[in-house]
């Protein structure tokens, strides 16, 4: 049975030419983390593995950093950033845990952090 | 088009160190992916050995790690195989390819090294 | 270590045949798995990785399947080409293992 919960930075927003990062925490349960993925709509972003470590994919390697701990840091945003991404753990013997967060860029400077939320 | 190319001794005594490097030519080691040693075994057996990462960080298969080293030279674009105290055991054919999330997109031609007095 | 069951060893089969070959792994690996084909005297060629996913270039006649722990590669209509050993490899864990190849013969 899955216990599990993932808590994520929920609907946040950053200025376009800033950076912000992505976190997703895994909690209420006692599985092991094998490996995390970071995901942007359909586009596989990175890949954490608990035994390989970080893969970035080539074609976001410019603007994507692994990190803090299992969490992304995106780099240089564009408008085109906007949209949802998914933190999705792997882990043993739950299976796999989904955590969404909504990324919207702003032109301008009010760019504010959404508050924090639950994803069972 | 990326091209990888293996060179190195094709005979090595048993207790030596083997080293191997890994040319590689239209792509920049430093600018993404990983790049990976890999050897086939007489018997068609393909065992992964380890990779640098463009950023230079290293995993090497637990079963060498006593006795691998990968590095790389990025003024040259190169990357390298130091395996020590070989025995004849390590005669094989060793590849160096290019990993993306932990497969291998391109390969090496493969360069067959003999571990013999 | 994860460990990669392929069956069969060997396979004879004519051109124009369908030809299936499997992949059994000691532990669920989700879709993280790539198929490889290398003929003799070459260097492996990627074929498939994620479990399905056709390689740039590959031909369509290959597709690749499963999740978890069992996984197949299929070949309709063989093309004189297609003859060597196929290998499957899992990108899961470290180690990163192969199975022990399936070789493909012209009958």
């Known amino acids: 049975m899955m216990t599990g919960t993932i808590e994520t930075t929920g609907n946040i927003s950053a200025e376009k030419g800033g950076s912000i990062i992505l976190q997703c925490h895994l909690s209420s349960t006692t599985a092991q983390v094998t490996q995390v993925n970071w995901e942007q709509q359909d586009q596989l972003l990175a890949i954490c593995n608990a035994d390989l470590g970080w893969h970035i994919s080539p074609s976001f390697k410019d603007r994507v950093a692994p990190g803090p701990g299992l969490g992304l840091t995106l780099q240089s945003l564009t408008v085109n950033d906007t949209g949802e991404y998914f933190c999705i753990y792997h882990t043993y013997p739950d299976g796999t845990y989904t955590g969404r967060i909504f990324l919207e860029v702003l032109e301008s400077s009010v760019a504010e952090h959404g508050a924090r939320f639950q994803i069972p | 088009d990326v091209q990888l190319q293996e060179s190195g001794p094709g005979l090595v005594k048993p207790s030596q160190s083997l080293s191997l490097t890994c040319t590689v030519t239209g792509y920049s080691i430093t600018s993404a992916y990983d790049w990976h040693w890999i050897r086939l075994f007489p018997g068609h057996i393909l065992e992964w050995m380890g990779y640098i990462s463009y950023s230079g960080n290293t995993i090497y298969n637990p079963s060498l790690k006593s006795r691998i080293s990968i590095t790389h030279d990025t003024s040259k674009n190169h990357f390298f195989l130091k395996l020590n105290s070989v025995t004849t055991e390590d005669t094989a054919t060793y590849y160096c390819?290019?990993?993306?999330?932990?497969?291998?997109?391109?390969w090496g031609a493969g360069t067959t090294v003999t571990v013999s007095s | 270590d994860i460990q990669m069951t392929q069956s069969p060893a060997s396979l004879s089969a004519s051109v124009g045949e369908t030809v299936t070959i499997t992949c059994r792994v000691s532990?669920?690996?989700?879709?993280?798995l790539a198929w490889y084909q290398q003929k003799q005297g070459k260097s492996p060629q990627l074929l498939v990785y994620n479990a399905k996913t056709l390689a740039e270039g590959v031909p369509s006649r290959f597709s690749g399947s499963g999740s978890g722990t069992q996984f197949s590669l299929k070949i309709n209509s063989l093309q004189p080409e297609d003859f060597g050993t196929y290998y499957c490899?899992?990108?899961?864990?470290?180690?990163?293992?192969f199975g022990a190849g399936t070789k493909v013969e012209l009958k």
């Open positions: 532990e669920h690996i989700y879709n993280y």
């Open positions: 390819a290019r990993g993306s999330f932990w497969y291998f997109d391109v």
């Open positions: 490899q899992h990108n899961y864990g470290n180690p990163l293992t």
